[in-house]
Interface confidence: medium
């Protein structure tokens, strides 16, 4: 089927368009182009007879049209009036006619737009500003940019007038920005120069600096005032309500007690017509007063609270000193002094931080000390301890248990047997016990001030038979080649033999294994990772025998010399480098990397994307085991071959 394709479809004024003919039939006599959607002799542009290769202009010919032997029509130097439909009339040799219609649209090349504004100096929180993009152009799309970004979503921003007008309601100082508009049509796009919005605001409440309010007689008083404002504020100072001067700074040399009083700074914005004031009260001392300590927390809770102790009063140009337990301050990461030394902060207080604390003010001849302050640190209760430590009793004896937990204020105690409350006392006494008194004995300690509770449970067995023993250890995480471990078989019982097994075998002969305390204690000297085995103890007498559950020793070791994988040392430019480091260690070590001595990330895997010869060098993996306190490292050299595509990666 005969079709017309316009190339391009959207044409800029002054450019050219080609009406391209597709599927032109064979055996043609000639063809004619017409302006419009039908064949109309009055609107003929040009005709062409194939036999003579003769082109004949028609009434609508403008001199800008060229017809080609393949029937395509080129129109040059396009004008707005050229928009519309064009019809090709084909006359075949058999005099059967065929027609096809195509079209194109003409758009003007857009001029550079500009922004007009209805308010060049809007006032914050009061005025609205309407920006309009000029000129108004038909068939154009309008876009807006703020600081070269597209418009943010905001209820204060509104587009209207076909997006040609941008209105900012209730402007704020944050609307001070670069605004641009852009016009677009299918053939061109133009952006305006930027317009900077100048929002008038303030003054905000002024701030007076420095913040000190106490001074000594003879010092200079130098106060500065600042308030955010556009245009910048004009400042005035008043002392006790009396105007002093119109400056941003107030300077009074060699002050006396008579200079004590209220100092007011007034900030004024001549454009917005607004005034704001701030008052500070200045005290001038003839001599430094006796200092005293204030605390932001009189009953801090251990491991929870921080306490800030402040030495009062605040006096300009004064040296503050502190003592704890009648000693100068110890070096501790939990003790922090403010820049002027006036505030001592104890981070995460402990029960050992009670004090006493004293502060002092240095004067010309001596140091004035405050009265001592003692902190009442609330702590505990710690895990209560139940004594005596026996867990195995014979029938007929008296059971007397005592409970104690470190706590401030002192703990309140309760006893439970098999979960049932017995009494609210520190001691529990049961006479002439029987096997029915076997069970779980719980001591509960409660601190009413901190609200914390802790419990300890002890299993009491009353039996003529031996109980199942258990193993206690003096070191649950010993370090290889350094620590010793003492295992003790519980409970302690009279006329009893103690036995030991390792991994189900009787004890091997070794100078590092030692039995003591009637074979009840097994000590391993200089543990190694191979000692991480299952240990079982047994007790036996003439009536019965029993074995403990196994206890597996968790030996901390390493880190051993690390291994970097993959082993490759040469890479191609553009590859991603992915090095993994591994070291035998318990617990798992912390990994870090250095490249040519420069610290990198603290990860087991080092990843660098798109390496180049600049990545050549030494890659060191460092491993550290915080539990053993040991470190190790290994270094690997990496070579990167240059890219074949100079000067680098193409995009």
């Amino acid at each position: 089927k005969l079709t017309i394709e316009s190339t391009p479809f959207n044409v800029a004024e002054g450019k050219e368009v080609l009406l391209l003919v597709h599927n032109l039939p064979q055996h043609l006599f000639g063809y004619s182009w017409y302006k419009g959607e039908r064949v109309d002799g009055n609107r003929q542009i040009i005709g062409y007879v194939i036999g003579t290769q003769q082109a004949t202009p028609g009434p609508a010919y403008s001199g800008r049209e060229i017809i080609y032997p393949n029937a395509s029509l080129l129109i040059q130097n396009i004008i707005q009036n050229d928009t519309g439909f064009y019809t090709l009339h084909v006359i075949k040799s058999d005099l059967v006619n065929e027609e096809a219609t195509g079209q194109f649209r003409v758009y003007p090349e857009l001029p550079k737009p500009s922004i007009s504004s209805n308010n060049s100096k809007p006032v914050e929180d009061k005025d609205a500003v309407a920006f309009t993009c000029e000129p108004e152009t038909q068939d154009a799309t309008y876009l807006w940019w703020v600081n070269n970004q597209s418009l943010p979503v905001s209820p204060r921003l509104q587009l209207s007038n076909g997006n040609r007008t941008l209105t900012l309601f209730n402007v704020t100082r944050n609307d001070t920005a670069s605004y641009k508009c852009e016009t677009q049509n299918p053939v061109s796009a133009r952006r305006s120069d930027s317009v900077i919005l100048n929002v008038l605001y303030g003054p905000d409440a002024p701030t007076i600096s420095p913040l000190n309010t106490s001074y000594r007689s003879g010092e200079n008083l130098n106060l500065s005032c600042h308030a955010a404002s556009n245009p910048p504020a004009q400042y005035s100072w008043f002392v006790n309500g009396t105007f002093q001067q119109s400056t941003q700074e107030l300077f009074i040399p060699n002050i006396t007690v008579n200079n004590s009083g209220s100092y007011t700074c007034q900030a004024h914005n001549s454009d917005t017509g607004l005034n704001r004031t701030t008052v500070t009260t200045i005290t001038v001392y003839a001599e430094p007063p006796k200092p005293f300590i204030t605390s932001n927390n009189s009953n801090p809770v251990e491991d929870e609270d921080a306490v800030a102790l402040t030495c009062e009063p605040e006096i300009q140009n004064t040296t503050y000193l502190w003592w704890v337990n009648n000693q100068s301050l110890p070096v501790s990461p939990r003790l922090q002094l403010s820049n002027d030394n006036r505030t001592l902060t104890l981070l995460s207080v402990t029960r050992n931080d009670v004090g006493p604390y004293e502060c002092g003010i240095q004067n010309k001849l001596s140091v004035d000390h405050s009265d001592p302050v003692i902190l009442n640190v609330l702590y505990g209760p710690d895990d209560p301890t139940i004594s005596p430590s026996y867990t195995y009793y014979r029938p007929g004896v008296n059971l007397s248990l005592s409970c104690h937990a470190a706590s401030n204020p002192p703990a309140q105690y309760s006893w439970l047997i098999d979960g049932n409350i017995q009494q609210h006392t520190q001691e529990l006494f049961i006479s002439n016990i029987t096997e029915k008194n076997s069970g779980l004995y719980t001591c509960q300690a409660n601190n009413s001030a901190s609200g914390h509770s802790r419990t300890t449970v002890k299993t009491i067995t009353v039996s003529a038979e031996l109980p199942k023993p258990s193993i206690s250890s003096n070191n649950s995480k010993p370090v290889e080649d350094k620590d010793a471990v003492a295992f003790t078989c519980e409970p302690e019982a009279q006329n009893t033999t103690y036995l030991w097994w390792v991994n189900g075998q009787s004890l091997p002969v070794s100078p590092r294994l030692q039995l003591s305390n009637g074979n009840r204690t097994l000590t391993l000297f200089n543990v190694t990772r191979n000692d991480a085995r299952a240990y079982v103890c047994g007790i036996q007498n003439s009536v019965s025998a029993n074995r403990s559950d196994p206890v597996t020793l968790d030996v901390l070791y390493g880190p051993d010399t690390p291994i970097i994988s993959p082993p490759d040392s040469s890479y191609l430019s553009g590859a991603n480098l992915n090095l993994s480091c591994h070291s035998a260690s318990n617990p798992s070590p912390q990994y870090s990397w250095r490249i040519n001595g420069i610290p990198q990330q603290h990860t087991q895997v080092l990843f660098i994307a798109k390496i180049t010869p600049n990545n050549n060098g030494t890659y060191a993996c460092f491993v550290s085991n915080l539990a053993t306190g040991r470190n190790n490292s290994i270094v690997k050299s990496i070579t990167v071959s240059a890219s074949g595509t100079s000067p680098g990666l193409s995009a």
Epitope: L572, G574, T645
Partner: antibody, heavy 120, light 106 residues
Amino acid sequence: QVQLVQSGAEVKKPGASVKVSCKASGFNIKDSYMHWVRQAPGQGLEWMGWIDPENGDTEYAPKFQGRVTMTTDTSISTAYMELSRLRSDDTAVYYCNEGTPTGPYYFDYWGQGTLVTVSS
Amino acid sequence: EIQMTQSPSSLSASVGDRVTITCRASSSVSYMHWYQQKPGKAPKLLIYSTSNLASGVPSRFSGSGSGTDFTLTISSLQPEDFATYYCQQRSSYPLTFGGGTKLEIK
């Protein structure tokens, strides 16, 4: 499992261009480099270059520089290789390969190949 | 560009034979990969980084070498091993392949 499925055979005239596609499945195309290797009839293998689908970075063999363009559309997990200004000696089977970004640039997954014939 | 020369270019052998194919690089390379290709099929990775067996490849295939000289060895030829074998270097752009060794049944 990893699969690379390439577009069908093409016949082109000298001077024309050809664009071969390679659809990946069974892995995230952004995690790999896509390489292209060709093999002329009865001849050996010839590496053409790679593209990083994550950001469009490329590395081309100098022989093909200026004639080859490698692109990807990660939304449909497809890589493309376009070779322009074709000559008769460009007649070959073109393979796409998946390669790990960390080197060592060996090819364990290959497309089935696309035969491009250049003939007047 | 690193040139890769494979030898021999073709060789005849019998089932059960031990076969060695050599690949020589025009300058030193760090690693070599080896591929097997059967007619009408895409190549298949056999050995990567000189000596590592690719997944699913029988243990009768092995690789060795360093610097400029590398070898692929088939310890005991099986009927399915008759194919063309290519080496490939990965140390310098452009990546280059050897010209191939065609292994035929004697």
